[in-house]
Amino acid sequence: VPRWRQQWSGPGTTKRFPETVLARCVKYTEIHPEMRHVDCQSVWDAFKGAFISKHPCNITEEDYQPLMKLGTQTVPCNKILLWSRIKDLAHQFTQVQRDMFTLEDTLLGYLADDLTWCGEFNTSKINYQSCPDWRKDCSNNPVSVFWKTVSRRFAEAACDVVHVMLNGSRSKIFDKNSTFGSVEVHNLQPEKVQTLEAWVIHGGREDSRDLCQDPTIKELESIISKRNIQFSCKNIYRPDKFLQCVKNPEDSSCTSEI
C-alpha cells in the first residue's frame, strides 16, 4: 500500500540537498582557513537532525541549536551589512568590500543560501516533492525557522554602525514582514549598536527622488529611534557606479554623488 504523503504548497527539497550542504561546507573551510576546525560531517548531521523525522510545521529554534553551536563564527561586529529584497547587490558589494559581511558570507548562511528543505514526521526521508509555504501552510517550517534563527543571531552580534541595503524599486522599501523588518531590526542591541545606516538602492536611471523620505523609511526610522539607536539614510542613485567606486575609490568620477 503506497504511504500517504502530505502535499504542501511550496517547492520540495532542493535536489542533491545533502551533497550540496556537505560540499558547501568543505568549500567554505577551504576558502576560509579560520573555519577549518569545523567538522563538515558533524555540521551535516546537525543540520539533518534539525528537521528529519519532524513535522515540517512544528520546527523550533531549539531544533537548530546543535547546528548553531557547530557553526559559531566571529565576524567583525562593526562590519555587518544587512539587506532586504536586494540580495544580489549586497553580495556583489561584500565581494568587493572584503572586510564587510552579509549573513550569507558566514558559514551557516553560505550553507543554506537559496536552498529549500523539509522532512516528514516519523520517517527519516527528505521530502523532495513539496515543503510548507510560509503563507499558505505554516510559518514554523524548517527553512523559515532556520533563517529566523541565524538572522536573529547575526543581528544580535552587530555593533557600532550597522548598514542595511534596501530596494528602492519596491512598493514597500522597508517591509515590516521581511526578515530584516520582523527579526533583524528587533534584535539589534541598543547597548552595542550606535547607528543603523540605510542605503536605499534606486532602480531607474533617471530616478532622482529622495527615497529616504519614503513613508516606509520614516517608519523604519521611528522603530529604530524608539530602540535608542540612531538612524541615517543615503540614496544610492547609481548602484552600478556605486560598485565601481567601491572597487576604484580613487576614480575621479567617484567624488560626485552616487
Epitope: L22, K27, R36
Partner: antibody, heavy 123, light 112 residues
Framework: QVQLVQSGAEVKKPGASVKVSCKAS????????MHWVRQAPGQGLEWMGW????????DYAQKLQGRVTMTADTSTSTAYMELRSLRSDDTAVYYC????????????????WGQGTLVTVSS | DIVMTQTPLSLSVTPGQPASISCQSS???????????LNWYLQKPGQPPQLLIY???TRAAGVPDRFSGSGSGTDFTLKISRVEAEDVGVYYC?????????FGQGTKLEIK
C-alpha cells in the same frame, strides 16, 4: 575520473588580454573551488586566485588585482581566467587546479591539475 | 605572505640511494584543528605538478610509499627512501595554511 582540460597556447602582444578556459569533467563542477596557478619559464609556481563556480565569488592574488578576472559557466562546467594589460613578465604556463576531498575535509593540496596553457607575451 | 624556503636547490642522487629535501616556512603551518598545512609536489619535465604529500605527512592517492613527509610547525622534510629514475623533476613545498598559498622556489632532483 576527474579531468581538467585547458584551452590551447596563445601568443599575445603587450597590452592585450588573454582568456584561458578550463573544462572540468568527472565530478560536480559547483561542488569544488577552482584555483589558478601560473609558472613563468624556468621559474617556480605562483598562485593567482580562486573562483567558487556555484556563487561566482572570487579571491585574487594582491599583485594581480585589477588585471585578472575569473569566471565560471556552470552550464558547460568551464572555468575561465582572463588577464588584461599583458606584459612580457606574464609569459607563463597557466594551470587550473582543484583539491581532493578526504572524508569531508579539503586536503589543502592541489590534487588535480589541467595540462597547462602556455601564454606568450611578445611584441 | 608566508615565505617558503627550500634547500638544496638541486640534488644529484644515485638510483637506490635515499634523498632528502628541506623546506622552511616563515610562520608555523600548524592549524588549531591539529593539521599542518604543508604540501609537497613533484613536477616532471613538461607536466603539471603532481601532489605527493598533504597535511605534512599524508601521502596522496597513488603515491609510492618510498615518499614520506615529516616536520614540525616551521621545518619540514620530504624523504625518498630509494630514489628511482622516474623521480627526476622539480620538487616544491607549498603552504596552504592561509591565503595566498605560497610555494618554495623548488629543488631539482637528477639522477647520477
Amino acid at each position: 575520473q576527474v579531468q581538467l582540460v585547458q584551452s590551447g597556447a596563445e601568443v599575445k602582444k603587450p597590452g592585450a588580454s588573454v582568456k584561458v578556459s578550463c573544462k572540468a569533467s568527472g565530478y560536480t563542477f559547483t561542488d569544488y573551488i577552482m584555483h589558478w596557478v601560473r609558472q613563468a619559464p624556468g621559474q617556480g609556481l605562483e598562485w593567482m586566485g580562486w573562483i567558487d563556480p556555484e556563487y561566482g565569488s572570487t579571491d585574487y592574488a594582491q599583485k594581480l588585482q585589477g588585471r585578472v578576472t575569473m569566471t565560471a559557466d556552470t552550464s558547460t562546467s568551464t572555468a575561465y581566467m582572463e588577464l588584461r594589460s599583458l606584459r612580457s613578465d606574464d609569459t607563463a604556463v597557466y594551470y587550473c587546479a582543484r583539491v581532493a576531498i578526504i572524508t569531508t575535509v579539503a586536503s589543502g593540496g592541489f590534487a588535480y591539475w589541467g595540462q597547462g596553457t602556455l601564454v606568450t607575451v611578445s611584441s | 605572505d608566508i615565505v617558503m624556503t627550500q634547500t638544496p636547490l638541486s640534488l644529484s642522487v644515485t638510483p637506490g640511494q635515499p634523498a632528502s629535501i628541506s623546506c622552511q616556512s616563515s610562520e608555523s603551518l600548524l592549524h588549531s584543528n591539529g593539521k599542518t598545512y604543508l604540501n609537497w609536489y613533484l613536477q616532471k619535465p613538461g607536466q603539471p605538478p603532481q601532489l605527493l604529500i598533504y597535511w605534512m605527512s599524508t601521502r596522496a592517492a597513488g603515491v609510492p610509499d618510498r615518499f614520506s613527509g615529516s616536520g614540525s610547525g616551521t621545518d619540514f622534510t620530504l624523504k625518498i627512501s630509494r630514489v628511482e629514475a622516474e623521480d627526476v623533476g622539480v620538487y616544491y613545498c607549498q603552504q596552504f595554511l592561509e591565503y595566498p598559498p605560497t610555494f618554495g622556489q623548488g629543488t631539482k632532483l637528477e639522477i647520477k
